[in-house]
């Protein structure tokens, strides 16, 4: 079942999932000037059987200006730089993920995707928080939130994290180095 609301917002922190439970949906959002192709699915869905989970459907964006074409527009230098960073981040995320049964890994980027990813999480999902660049973590407990449910009532637990002052960002589970991204990682992790 889907979680009714978003994971909690922590000031000066971002969250990400190390892996996504089956049933999770990721909106196929495109950056400004692009739109989802007409025949394209509105979302990707994490599905699987007992041995393997993967994302169903692929997101595809096309130029809003171009009519009835799926031809991709070559990114401008600034866009290429931004895409490289996102690709690098995704590769790093993939590298530090262990295959969990019943879970999908972070989907790779698609061309001209929006900067912000919008996930629809399911009950039982855990997300992990880290402070953005320039803030350090004060932990009172785990910097994570779990979507739990009792008979239709869903709620995210409150992560025990405060981000304060100046220093390197804290790390997500499985990451050895703090991320180089100026906004911390992921730059865009949100849910519906």
């Amino acid at each position: 079942e889907l979680c009714d609301d978003d994971p909690p917002k922590i000031t000066h922190a971002t969250f990400k999932a190390v892996a996504y439970k089956e049933g999770t949906m990721l909106n196929c959002e495109c950056k400004r000037g692009f739109r989802r192709i007409k025949s394209g699915s509105p979302y990707m869905l994490c599905t699987g059987n007992s041995s393997h989970s993967s994302w169903d459907n692929q997101c595809q964006c096309t130029s809003s200006a171009a009519r009835n074409t799926t031809k991709q527009v070559t990114p401008q230098p600034e866009e290429q730089k931004e895409r490289k960073t996102t690709e690098m981040q995704s590769q790093m995320q993939l590298a530090d993920q262990v295959s969990l049964p019943g879970h999908c890994r972070e989907p790779p980027p698609w061309e001209n995707e929006a900067t912000e990813r919008i996930y629809h999480f399911v009950v039982g999902q855990t997300v992990y928080y880290q402070c953005v660049q320039g803030y350090r973590a004060l932990h009172r407990g785990p910097a994570e939130s779990v979507c739990k449910m009792t008979h239709g009532k869903t709620r995210w637990t409150q992560p025990q994290l405060i981000c304060t002052g100046e220093t390197e960002p804290s790390q997500f589970p499985g990451e050895e180095e703090p991320q180089a991204s100026p906004d911390g990682l992921p730059e865009s992790e949100t849910s519906r």
Epitope: K148, M149, T150, H151, G152
Partner: antibody, heavy 119, light 112 residues
Framework: EVQLQQSGAELVRPGASVKLSCTAS????????VHWVKQRPEQGLEWIGY????????EYASKFLGKATITADTSSNTAYLQLSSLTSEGTAVYYC????????????WGLGTLVTVSA | DVLMTQTPLSLPVSLGDQASISCRSS???????????LEWYLQKPGQSPKLLIY???NRFSGVPDRFSGSGSGTDFTLKISRVEAEDLGVYYC?????????FGGGTKLEIK
């Protein structure tokens, strides 16, 4: 292994109070809801209420309002049921149970605590 | 409160027979989110209850496929295709759609 360990049997006088405990092992109660269920001798099951240990929110069946109080201590991974002003109607086995994280149903049960109210 | 009525109160069966238990709610138990939180629990003598079926027809992990649940709205049924000795005990239906959540009175499955 996921388990709920409940406190031992209690013999209490009419009008007195008793506090039962339910300690979880193998999981963090903060990430769950803990419920209490009553079963009188040779009778059926009655849902008393639940607590969200993460924030202390509780919900009770109306017949147990003012009679039962559910609390939790996340540091010891324990939930409690306090029963007050007990009468012979309070003689029962009290079970704690938690939801399966993914399904939200009563998947894990303690073995129960027998409370006997007698003069 | 939603009243859950189970029939029969007692169900004598022979091992290998099919058993069917009915549960009727006093009002629709469709939750506001569209799901129906109707569950079946088995309590064996001297033990805690155990979850068998959730959301009307979904078997909980480890529950044998001889158990099946069906129904909608206010009428629900638990079927055991071939009764085994380990299935004996008291079966309870439960609704978790409307607070206060309520159990049925129980059906005792026993050897004929």
């Amino acid at each position: 292994e996921v388990q709920l360990q409940q406190s031992g049997a209690e013999l209490v006088r009419p009008g007195a109070s008793v506090k039962l405990s339910c300690t979880a092992s193998g999981f963090n109660i903060k990430n769950d809801y803990v419920h209490w269920v009553k079963q009188r001798p040779e009778q059926g099951l009655e849902w008393i209420g639940y607590i969200d240990p993460d924030n202390g929110d509780t919900e009770y069946a109306s017949k147990f309002l003012g009679k039962a109080t559910i609390t939790a201590d996340t540091s010891s991974n324990t939930a409690y049921l306090q029963l007050s002003s007990l009468t012979s109607e309070g003689t029962a086995v009290y079970y704690c149970t938690t939801d399966d994280t993914s399904y939200g149903m009563f998947a894990c049960w303690g073995l129960g605590t027998l409370v006997t109210v007698s003069a | 409160d939603v009243l859950m009525t189970q029939t029969p109160l007692s169900l004598p069966v022979s091992l290998g027979d099919q058993a069917s238990i009915s549960c009727r709610s006093s009002q629709s138990i469709v939750h506001s989110n569209g799901n129906t939180y109707l569950e079946w629990y088995l309590q064996k003598p001297g033990q805690s209850p155990k979850l068998l079926i959730y959301k009307v027809s979904n078997r909980f992990s480890g529950v044998p496929d001889r158990f099946s649940g069906s129904g909608s709205g206010t009428d629900f049924t638990l079927k055991i295709s071939r009764v085994e000795a380990e299935d004996l005990g008291v079966y309870y239906c439960f609704q978790g759609s409307h607070v206060p959540w309520t159990f049925g009175g129980g059906t005792k499955l026993e050897i004929k």
